[in-house]
């Protein structure tokens, strides 16, 4: 007989998730309405396509990227979809409450859905560090806390540091990475005897993870350009992101081979490193004046990513209990920092070039912005980690980590747990 959810979780999850969904429906009923204005239909279609690209990145890209575990691939993909669906709903409301609410109702536009999808993406990046060690009820908590923390961070940053939509959203890489790592740090770490094989990657799930990486690779330019407000900015962002990810692919594959004693290529390195350039140019993608700079950034990002994948997993596994194949967290944390540093360098060059004073003050503001993003990520991540450790959620036993059978019905399996 196939395994069942523990009784308590069977009671807890549907009740918790459906009550939450009912609450969201009520909030939408009382506080939202659609944008009633007449749209230019061509513009509407173009705007929808950007949102569609982001949804593909989230549902297929990040969904499959995290599916490389031997016995946890179903859960990775489906839990990602569940978190995305829930995260988008809450993010739309939260963004509306934080930015529009004083005027009455929250107006829902394609742009607000775009923003919400990007906010929900944050959770999908973070969750890579904890997938396999938590159940759906715990993931609901993680979605709510992280989306709320990111929404508030974006509002605080836009108000205090006066940054536009693009800039305050591009902290998502650093925020999501540090949030995920701090949640992982709070969860039970040691993998008990007999479960080591479960966090290993298998060929078919690894292939689906590569498929996820390919989708992300294709659509990363859309993500980096989605919130820019002019065609020339979007064009620069698309071009620079494309050049950066193209170079990071070449670097990832050749660097992975270089890092192996027999010159073999590691699937895990490649899954993650192909995206390195996109993360590194994210913040400054619209400011980089020529392709060669974006390409150099892609090269450096690819090398950092491969280097990180080679040397950091041991440390992360010991300290945070993150399996070797879940390298998105520390990868994004390093590459996000690289991207922020590049932005500050470009800002200094631009300020010097314009002959304006206050360079030191500008740099201080940028560093303050980055520091605030990291601090809020760590604090909210620790809070989430502590919440997830509460007995109420009936977390999977360590022996059931990285196991689809705990959550899914497999009629063809005779042996249960």
């Amino acid at each position: 007989m196939s395994s069942k959810y523990p009784r308590s979780v069977r009671r807890c999850l549907p009740l918790w998730a459906l009550t939450l969904e009912a609450a969201l429906i009520l909030l939408f009923y009382f506080f939202t309405h659609y944008d009633a204005s007449l749209e230019d239909q061509k513009g509407l279609v173009a705007s929808y396509q950007v949102g569609q690209d982001l949804t593909v990145m989230a549902a297929i890209g990040l969904g499959f990227l995290t599916s490389s575990f031997r016995r946890h691939s179903w859960s990775s993909v489906a839990f990602n979809l569940f978190m995305l669906a829930l995260g988008v709903q809450w993010a739309i409301l939260l963004d509306g409450f934080l930015s529009q609410f004083p005027s009455g109702k929250v107006v829902i536009t394609l742009f607000s859905i775009r923003l919400a999808t990007m906010s929900a993406l944050s959770v999908l990046i973070s969750v890579d560090a904890v997938l396999g060690k938590v159940n759906l009820a715990q993931l609901v908590v993680m979605v709510l806390v992280e989306v709320t923390a990111l929404g508030n961070l974006r509002m605080v940053i836009s108000n205090i540091f006066n940054t536009d939509y693009h800039m305050n959203m591009m902290h998502i890489y650093v925020f999501a990475a540090y949030f995920g790592l701090s949640v992982a740090w709070c969860l039970p770490k040691p993998l008990p005897e007999g479960t080591e094989d479960k966090d290993q990657t298998a060929t078919i799930p690894s292939l689906s993870a590569m498929l996820g990486a390919l989708f992300l690779w294709m659509f990363w330019p859309s993500f980096n350009s989605a919130l820019l407000r002019s065609p020339i900015e979007r064009k620069n962002a698309v071009f620079n992101t494309y050049y950066a990810v193209a170079v990071s692919v070449v670097t990832a594959i050749s660097g992975s081979s270089l890092a192996h004693p027999q010159g073999k290529i590691s699937k895990t390195y490649v899954h993650s490193a192909v995206l390195a350039g996109g993360v590194a140019v994210g913040t400054s993608c619209h400011l980089i004046p020529s392709p060669w700079l974006a390409m150099v950034l892609g090269l450096v990002a690819g090398l950092i990513s491969v280097g990180g994948a080679k040397y950091l997993p041991g440390c992360c596994n010991r300290v945070l209990g993150i399996p070797h194949s879940s390298i998105m967290g520390y990868n994004f944390s390093l590459l996000g920092l690289l991207g922020e540093i590049i932005y500050i360098v470009l800002l200094v060059l631009d300020t010097v070039g314009a002959g304006n004073g206050m360079i030191g003050f500008q740099v201080l503001l940028s560093i303050g912005e980055l520091s605030l993003a990291i601090v809020i990520a760590l604090m909210s991540g620790l809070l989430t980690g502590l919440l997830l450790n509460l007995k109420i959620w009936k977390a999977p036993h360590e022996a059931k980590y990285f196991d689809d059978q705990v959550f899914w019905k497999f009629p063809h399996l005779a042996v249960g747990f």
């Epitope: 509407l44 173009a46 742009f111 836009s158 108000n159 006066n162 002019s230 314009a354 503001l365």
Partner: antibody
């Protein structure tokens, strides 16, 4: 050369609606964000609303939020401002302006000559 | 509610130099507020002069220059001409949405 021509102004009673238009020529309209700015008689300029180049996002000043709607038709090279629930304090000359947004550059570049809206009973 | 403050009026002699400033109630003005300056003469539409702190439009005379001074945006006119007598407005962009807020305007008189 760049030309912006506002129309649709006039005298209207409080609580009624009015729709302003801004016809653009001499540049690629669909590549530019557009703004409405107003100026009450004898007073300073007040920013009203912005719409992005593709119409995907719009934002408003608090004083008009929920009452005014900015929209555009790129195929007609026209910008609109739908004004509902008009008040006496909405009396002003309304200007449309193009937005330059590139990297770390932001500007209201070209302005129309304006159209006068008078809200009076 | 954000307030942008300018000097209500300034007087300058022809050929002289004058600096108009623009302060924000939120604190120091930086290049991230993209300060813009406009000139408006009676009965005319505003005309853009300076954008993004110090950049000039193709039609902006060389005697106009923009900068940041002590946490404020500044517009400096060197070698003032009689035709520079006008109202000058600054515009700052705020927050994620980059909403515009104009200053109250400075009436420049050339005596």
């Amino acid at each position: 050369q760049v030309q912006l021509v506002e129309s649709g102004g006039g005298v209207v009673q409080p609580g009624r609606s009015l729709r302003l238009s801004c016809a653009a020529s001499g540049f690629t309209f669909s590549n530019y964000g557009m703004h409405w700015v107003r100026q009450a008689p004898g007073k300073g300029l007040e920013w009203v609303a912005v719409i992005w180049f593709d119409g995907s996002n719009r934002d408003y000043a608090d004083s008009v939020k929920g009452r005014f709607t900015i929209s555009r038709d790129n195929s007609k090279k026209t910008l609109y401002l739908q004004m509902n629930s008009l008040r006496a304090e909405d009396t002003a000359v309304y200007y449309c302006a193009t937005e330059l947004a590139r990297g770390r550059l932001r500007a209201l570049e070209y302005w129309g000559q304006g159209t006068l809206v008078t809200v009076s009973s | 509610q954000t307030v942008v403050t300018q000097e209500p009026s300034l007087t300058v002699s022809p050929g002289g130099t004058v600096t108009l400033t623009c302060a924000s109630s939120t604190g120091a003005v930086t290049t991230g507020y993209y300060p813009n300056w406009f000139q408006q003469k009676p009965g005319q539409a505003p005309r853009a002069l300076i954008y993004s702190t110090s950049k000039k439009h193709s039609w902006t005379p060389a005697r106009f220059s923009g900068s940041l001074l002590g946490g404020k945006a500044a517009l400096t006119l060197s070698g003032v001409q009689p035709e520079d007598e006008a109202e000058y407005y600054c515009l700052l962009f705020y927050g994620g949405a980059q909403l515009g807020v104009f200053g109250g305007g400075t009436k420049l008189t050339v005596l």
